[in-house]
Interface confidence: medium
């Protein structure tokens, strides 16, 4: 049978031939009758085999990590009749490891992201390198970890990789590191080989600081006539955090007058003072606010932080603007009565300079050729004034300041006019009536009616009588309805158109004001040549024929 | 040491014009609102004027307004109140006084110069 | 304008004794804008109170103020030989008044 050890050949051997064992059979007794042969992969170019002694050599370097073990096949044969003595068997040459290869970090590059201020112990990332050579062979892969840069802040952990923080690290001082881990094989013994890998630590933000004011007095000015809503000015504060926590909200910690607010402005983490009421120079010309920033996102257990929340005071100065004259009221109302003299007195106006320099007061009205005011507002008319043309005048008051006319102020003056009984009543139409010739006495001829173009506070009441002359020798007479109203009646029987064909009646009308004044009124009658029946009708049909220049017959 | 000190007072004839300086040390001067506040026997104390502490804004009271002008020179952490058309009620002792941060009252005030209008 | 009227015009009090001046404003004054200065003969005035009760630096507890709207105090709760001046209010609310002041002497 065949005899022969396990084979081993080391790699790296720089040596032109190495001997890597003997293969032989039992059956050669050395007096070189066999001969050896080599078969396989490798067989001749790799390994050659001593055809009398089966003696095996190496004759090029090898490489385990490249090829860790060659299968070969052997054969022997007696020469003398080329038979093989022994089956043809398979054997196998091991390719012993040395120590050739350092750590490699396979996974480059590496990068870790952890939040600032993390305790101690926090694992921020694992690193992992390989080593070519055999492990199972001694030392040569066993492999130690050791940081080269990183300390105090990092350590790694020798055998596993793992990089732990190892003291607390403020992203504000700082916001990356670069560690420099060492992988050394032969567990770190004299003669091993080591390999290095960069890893890049970003600390992440958490929110450890609080906002703080740019400035601890701001100083800002609005100006009187700013409508609500202005914005008068923005303030600013810094957070040396980043992103969400540095966002900010601002708010009003200290307004007495309640005259402002804050609102933020989340693009540019700014405040914007805001006016929340009018404000009147003349009323106050300063305030004091104070205004106070705080995160917008706060952790429970980072609270510790932000305990007392940043402050800062806002001069707030006023600026004056010129107003305009302010009257004492927003309208006015005056009485006089009709047909007092010209210049007469109709009421004052009053309006003042709202500014502190209280500047005078000129006064005019706006296209009026009744009334008249003086620079004290006096109102005056120019002319009578009769009511029963205008009850009523609309005035526009305009104030100027002396010191800037073009500070305007106008306001509406109402004037009315009182009623004084200056108007008798009269007839309130023209009134035609007839009569019949052959009318009995006590015949209604006519309701007649008055007017008074005075105003009157309680009812008017009109009186009717005729005239004296009428009332002594009259064929008529008039009784007072006592409504405003009278009838004419005739006062005999019988009428002679021939004779008297029209009768001019005067009718007193007199009203009930202090003193009463009295009007003549006159009532014309025509005498008609009437049918049986009595009716004026045809008779008023005869004078409509006449006035148009017909003759009836 | 923080102080005021006041100088340019004297007398004057009315309608005529005087200058008031103030110089400020110890302080950082151009932080600060600077105000003129003058004294007299009758009327007592009297605030005159202030500037911002940038002299970005002015402001002055009626009695003055037209006729006094504040101003400063930060450079040389100078106050100024240049007095035009004087009258004989703006005799007084001027004072400079410094306004506080957070408010309007005057925490530093110079020991005055005294203003005599007279014919 | 604000107008500050200081009572009493004189206080005569011996030292060791409690003073107590008044200064009422003829219309409320903002945010207790009120401040109290201290002015001896051919000197500046110094500020003793300002907000009304806040005391100015390196000024003696002794000096203590109080009051809002119209009517503030200074007191004085041991008069040392120091404290014999003329005290003046100011409100710094709207504008900047003065009052015409209280004179406390030795009595």
């Known amino acids: 049978g065949w005899v022969w050890n396990q084979f081993f050949v080391p790699e790296e051997m720089n040596t032109t031939s190495h001997h890597v064992g003997r293969l032989r059979s039992d059956l050669d007794n050395g007096n070189n009758s066999f001969q050896y042969k080599l078969l396989g992969a490798g067989a001749g170019s790799t390994f050659i085999i001593d055809e009398r002694t089966g003696d095996i050599y190496a004759i090029e370097k090898l490489d385990r990590e490249e090829r860790s073990l060659y299968i070969l096949r052997a054969q022997v044969i007696d020469i003398t009749t080329g038979r093989a003595v022994e089956p043809e068997s398979e054997f196998v040459i091991k390719v012993s490891d040395i120590n050739d290869n350092e750590p490699k970090f396979l996974d480059e590059p590496y990068e870790a992201i952890v939040p600032e201020m993390s305790p101690e112990g926090t694992l921020v990332i694992q690193v992992t390198a390989s080593d070519a050579d055999d492990p199972s062979s001694g030392n040569n892969a066993r492999l130690l970890y050791s940081l080269l840069q990183g300390q105090p802040y990092f350590s790694v952990e020798p055998t596993t990789g793992v990089i732990r923080i190892s003291s607390k690290m403020d992203r504000e001082l700082q916001d990356e590191y670069w560690v420099i881990i060492q992988a050394k094989d032969m567990i770190g013994q004299p003669g091993a080989l080591s390999g290095t890998t960069s890893v890049l630590i970003k600390l992440s933000d958490v929110n450890d600081n609080k906002p703080i004011f740019k400035e601890s007095l701001y100083r800002l000015t609005v100006s009187e006539s700013a409508p609500t809503g202005t914005s008068i000015g923005t303030i600013m504060a810094y957070d040396n955090d980043i992103g969400e926590n540095a966002e900010m909200d601002y708010s009003i910690e200290e307004d007495d007058s309640q005259t402002f607010d804050i609102i933020t402005n989340h693009e540019t983490q700014e405040g914007i003072v805001i006016l929340k009421k009018k404000v009147n120079f003349e009323h106050q010309n300063h305030y004091g606010i104070r205004a106070k920033v705080k995160n917008h996102h706060v952790d429970k257990q980072l609270m510790k932080y932000h305990t007392e929340a940043s402050t800062t005071f806002i001069k707030i100065q006023v600026e004056d603007v010129d107003e305009p004259p302010l009257f004492l009221l927003p309208y006015y109302i005056f009485e006089i009565f009709e047909e007092t003299p010209q210049g007469s007195f109709v009421g004052v106006v009053s309006a003042t300079d709202p500014d502190n320099r209280k500047s005078p007061i000129r006064y005019s009205i706006t296209r009026s050729k009744v009334f008249n005011i003086d620079d004290n507002g006096t109102i005056t008319t120019t002319n009578s004034l009769d009511r029963e043309i205008s009850a009523w005048y609309n005035l526009s008051i305009t104030a100027t300041e002396k010191y800037n006319i073009e500070q305007i102020s106008s306001i509406p003056v109402y004037v009315q006019v009182l009623n004084i009984n200056d108007h008798a009543p009269e007839f309130s139409q023209y009134y035609e009536s007839y009569v019949c010739e052959n009318a009995g006495s006590g015949q209604v001829i006519q309701t007649i009616s008055a007017v008074d173009r005075d105003e009157s506070i309680e009812e008017h009441h009109f009186y009717f009588n005729l005239s004296v002359e009428d009332t002594n020798s009259s064929s008529f007479t008039i009784i007072d309805n006592q409504d405003n109203t009278a009838v004419i009646l005739t006062n005999r029987t019988g009428f002679n158109l021939q004779e008297e064909p029209i009768f001019y009646i005067s009718i007193l009308i007199a009203d009930n004001g202090i003193p009463s004044l009295t009007s003549t009124n006159t009532l014309t009658i025509h005498v008609c040549d009437c049918d049986d029946s009595g009716s004026t009708q045809t008779c008023q049909y005869q004078e409509l024929m006449l006035s148009m220049g017909f003759k009836t017959e | 040491q923080v102080q005021l000190v006041e100088s340019g007072g004297g007398v004057v004839q009315p309608g005529r014009s005087l200058r008031l300086s103030c110089a400020a040390s110890?302080?950082?001067?151009?932080?600060?609102?600077m105000d003129w506040v003058r004294q007299t026997p009758g009327k007592g104390l009297e605030w005159v004027a202030v500037?911002?502490?940038?002299?970005?804004?002015?402001y002055y009271a009626d009695s003055v307004r037209g006729r006094f002008t504040i101003s400063r020179d930060n450079s040389k952490n100078t106050l100024f109140l240049q007095m035009n058309s004087l009258r004989v009620e703006d005799t007084a002792v001027y004072y400079c006084?410094?306004?506080?941060?957070?408010?309007?009252?005057?925490?530093?005030w110079g020991r005055g110069t005294l203003v005599t209008v007279s014919s | 304008e604000i107008v500050l009227t200081q009572s009493p015009g004189t206080l005569s009090l011996s030292p060791g004794e409690r003073a107590t001046l008044s200064c009422r404003a003829s219309?409320?004054?903002?945010?207790?804008?009120l401040a109290w200065y201290q002015q001896k003969p051919g000197q500046a005035p110094r500020l003793l109170i300002y907000?009304?009760?806040s005391r100015a630096t390196g000024i003696p507890d002794r000096f203590s103020g109080s009051g809002s709207g119209t009517d503030f105090t200074l007191t004085i709760s041991r008069l040392e030989p120091e404290d014999f001046a003329v005290y003046y209010c100011?409100?710094?609310?709207?504008?900047?008044?003065f009052g015409q002041g209280t004179k406390v002497e030795i009595k």
């Open positions: 006084a410094r306004e506080t941060g957070e408010g309007w009252y005057f925490d530093l």
């Open positions: 110890g302080f950082s001067f151009s932080s600060y609102d």
């Open positions: 500037i911002w502490y940038d002299g970005s804004n002015k």
């Open positions: 219309q409320s004054v903002s945010s207790s804008y």
């Open positions: 907000g009304a009760s």
């Open positions: 100011q409100q710094y609310g709207s504008s900047w008044t």
